[in-house]
Amino acid sequence: EPPTACREKQYLINSQCCSLCQPGQKLVSDCTEFTETECLPCGESEFLDTWNRETHCHQHKYCDPNLGLRVQQKGTSETDTICTCEEGWHCTSEACESCVLHRSCSPGFGVKQIATGVSDTICEPCPVGFFSNVSSAFEKCHPWTSCETKDLVVQQAGTNKTDVVCGPQDRLR
């Protein structure tokens, strides 16, 4: 009696169970009464990453330098190429199909987490006692200068964008 279901790594065709092709190979002929499933290796720059009955291998992803992409891991016959972004850029999605420039944190904000190839800069507002006076993708909020430790006094209060201005203490004459 013809099978209605097949074992793992097999598929049903023409009332018989045929072996699937292993990762890295594509199907060129279903099995017959007289022959096993016939598979051929994927070509250069192609891959298949599962047991399959695909008649065409998939093309490796192209890491387009015009989109800021570069190869993080070269593809094999069984794996796709993994792209990442050039220094200073990060992926716009999990699939990393294009890159955008890392965001800079504006004055008044500091870098909480430096960007990676896959995540953007995370900024945070500078809390009281800290400031940032530059637009930067790397600079954290800096603490206000402590005038006291320099034996000086605050002449101008700091803000989230400016440091305090210290000056000499008034001397009693």
Partner: antibody
Framework: QVQLKESGPGLVKPSETLSLTCTVS????????VHWIRQPPGKGLEWIGV???????NYNSALMSRVTISKDNSKSQVFLKMSSVTAADTAVYYC????????WGQGTLVTVSS | DVVMTQSPLSLPVTLGQPASISCRSS???????????LQWYLQRPGQSPGLLIY???NRFSGVPDRFSGSGSGTDFTLKISRVEAEDVGVYYC?????????FGQGTKLEIK
């Protein structure tokens, strides 16, 4: 029913290229492979190669450098070309449908001689 | 490539008597699927080869039941229980488990 018919010149000069055609009926070239097999007079059978449904090919490594198999799906024809032939290539050449091993063509005798 | 070795190469048999042909392969013909793709063909004088047995022991449709195939791994046998006049010709074993497909040298069966 499945039928295959081999055709081509019966005489080829040494160092020239042997060209044969296999015309098939009863099955579809876009969904089935075709093999070429040869048999020198009074000797055994030798598998030459196959062209699969999608156009991919496998060849006998001993003949690979001289053999090309191609096809024209619209004409239901498969072609065998073998370059730089010698007297050792004198044989009956058969084509065979993949999965139809019960049906062989009648074969065509190719003699390599000057 | 898988080398197929047949014996004997010549087999004179009396009509009505049994006959046996051996075929050995240089490596196992068992595919990872568990199937073994070993065929037997008969080439009658002046004709193309005709399929007798496939997958070691399956008789092709229309093949008389006096023909039987057996074996496993690398050792295979074709038996004819009672030879008839129409059985004369050259018998070939063939493997299609591994590319390139290969054939035995052939065994010529003739009537004594």
């Amino acid at each position: 029913q499945v039928q295959l018919k081999e055709s081509g010149p019966g005489l080829v000069k040494p160092s020239e290229t042997l060209s044969l055609t296999c015309t098939v009926s009863g099955f579809s070239l876009p969904t089935s492979g075709v093999h070429w097999i040869r048999q020198p007079p009074g000797k055994g059978l030798e598998w030459i190669g196959v062209i699969w449904a999608g156009g991919d090919t496998n060849y006998n490594s001993a003949l690979m450098s001289r053999v090309t198999i191609s096809k024209d799906n619209s004409k239901s024809q498969v072609f065998l070309k073998m370059s730089s032939v010698t007297a050792a290539d004198t044989a009956v050449y058969y084509c065979l449908g993949h999965g139809h091993f019960d049906v062989w063509g009648q074969g065509t005798l190719v003699t390599v001689s000057s | 490539d898988v080398v197929m070795t047949q014996s004997p190469l010549s087999l004179p048999v009396t009509l009505g008597q049994p006959a046996s042909i051996s075929c050995r392969s240089s490596q196992s013909l068992v595919h990872s699927s568990g199937n073994t793709y070993l065929q037997w063909y008969l080439q009658r004088p002046g004709q193309s080869p005709g399929l007798l047995i496939y997958k070691v022991s399956n008789r092709f449709s229309g093949v008389p039941d006096r023909f039987s195939g057996s074996g496993s791994g690398t050792d295979f046998t074709l038996k004819i229980s009672r030879v008839e006049a129409e059985d004369v010709g050259v018998y070939y074993c063939s493997q299609t488990t591994h590319v390139p497909w290969t054939f035995g040298q052939g065994t010529k069966l003739e009537i004594k």
